[in-house]
């Protein structure tokens, strides 16, 4: 299972993606800036195990799929780019899914990092509700689209985790 | 390590034309946006604009609209502040910093060590 | 453009002082301001941001508040490098303005 390599290529590319889809200029958008509370420290003073990595991993993935998988999202990005992000992040799913089957086996997928999962969850409710609060105002997935590209590149420790042997 | 490391100082004349630099390093370039700021000789801060490198997307203040202008180089982690026809009025110390864009973060938490310009007949 | 508008323009005061300089803002800019401490010669440095947020590296007897328009910075303790000239910033919006600086004198 050689995900250090595809995983860091599939999210390089999601990044491109996700920098080109913006539609306005941000310097209008400063106002909406918003404390969304990514839980870095928590990612910070943990070593992740491969698996733990992986699922935390999917899980931020797979709230970033959903959360640009809405009608709201279809409505602000451009839709050919939106696409492509969205099939970038299906395939890093895919990839992740396989590597816990051939790591664990199918039925000893970890549950040891359910606060992990929590957490990321709780701060993607968090931008969700910041949207709805924003009345999904351009500036706000502006402010959203920043927030995901930097949670992105924060999550260096679950990559390092990736690279470990259980 | 984080660094902004600016050009070195300029003597000009009036009428010349100058462009100044700022070297990003320690961080990825593109997720900050640079952000310039004139300190006249005695006074205070003045912003004068910002670029995004990413895209060289550029927002500056109305004092320095047209006065000057900031654009950057990506590929090498540089963003500049140009001039094309300088006045003994532009004499001051150039800063330039870093901002986190729209993300919530200290604002201009790294700055360079300053370009100091004069601008003298 | 958000004026901004510090007070006072300059002090004089003694190590161990508690020393407060205040920060006005032309309109609302929620707890979007900056505090930078200037030595001669030198580059600001960030002490507090969004209003009361202290900046990784910056001595606890630094501290700020206020929300809207006014705004406060405090040293609790005034200890002999803290002899400079502060600057309040809004970062609510373009353009982005400065205070015109507090300078910080010894008594």
């Known amino acids: 299972c050689d995900l250090p390599q595809t995983h860091s290529l599939r999210n390089r590319r999601a990044l491109i993606l996700l920098a080109q889809m913006g539609r306005i200029s941000p310097f209008s958008c400063l106002k909406d800036r918003h404390e969304f509370r990514f839980p870095e420290e928590e990612f910070d003073g943990h070593q992740f195990q491969k698996t733990q990595a992986i699922s935390v991993l999917h899980e931020m993935i797979q709230q970033t799929f959903n959360l640009f998988s809405t009608e709201d999202s279809s409505a602000a990005w451009e839709q050919s780019l939106l696409e492509k992000f969205s099939t970038e992040l299906y395939q890093q799913l895919n990839d992740l899914e396989a590597c816990v089957i051939q790591e664990v086996g199918v039925e000893e997928t970890p549950l040891m990092n359910e606060d992990f999962i929590l957490a990321v969850r709780k701060y993607f409710q968090r931008i969700t509700l910041y949207l709805m609060e924003k009345k999904y105002s351009p500036c706000a997935w502006e402010v959203v689209r920043a927030e995901i590209m930097r949670s992105f590149s924060f999550s260096t420790n679950l990559k390092k985790g990736l690279r470990r042997k259980d | 390590e984080v660094q902004l490391v600016q050009s070195g100082a300029e003597v000009k004349k009036p009428g010349e034309s100058l462009k100044i630099s700022c070297k990003g390093s320690g961080y990825s370039f593109t997720s900050y946006w640079i952000g310039w700021v004139r300190q006249m000789p005695g006074k205070g801060l003045e912003w004068m604009g910002i670029?995004?490198?990413?895209?060289?997307?550029?927002a500056y203040s109305p004092s320095f609209q047209g006065q000057v202008t900031i654009s950057a180089d990506k590929s090498i982690s540089t963003a500049y502040l140009q001039w094309s026809s300088l006045k003994a009025s532009d004499t001051a110390m150039y800063y330039c910093?870093?901002?986190?864009?729209?993300?919530?973060?200290?604002?201009?938490?790294?700055w360079g060590q300053g370009t100091l310009v004069t601008v003298s007949s | 453009d958000i004026q901004m508008t510090q007070s006072p323009s300059s002090l004089s005061a003694s190590v161990g002082d508690r020393v407060t300089i205040t920060c006005r803002a032309s309109q609302s800019i929620d707890g979007a301001l900056n505090w930078y401490q200037q030595k001669p010669g030198k580059a600001p440095k960030l002490l507090i941001y969004?209003?009361?947020s202290l900046q990784s590296g910056v001595p606890s007897r630094f501290s700020g508040s206020g929300s809207g328009t006014d705004f406060t910075l405090t040293i609790s303790s005034l200890q002999p490098e803290d002899f400079a000239t502060y600057y309040c910033q809004q970062s609510f919006d373009f353009p982005l303005t400065f205070g015109q600086g507090t300078k910080v004198e010894i008594k």
């Open positions: 969004f209003a009361s």
């Open positions: 670029i995004d490198p990413s895209d060289s997307d550029t």
């Open positions: 910093a870093r901002h986190p864009g729209l993300n919530w973060a200290p604002d201009f938490d790294y």
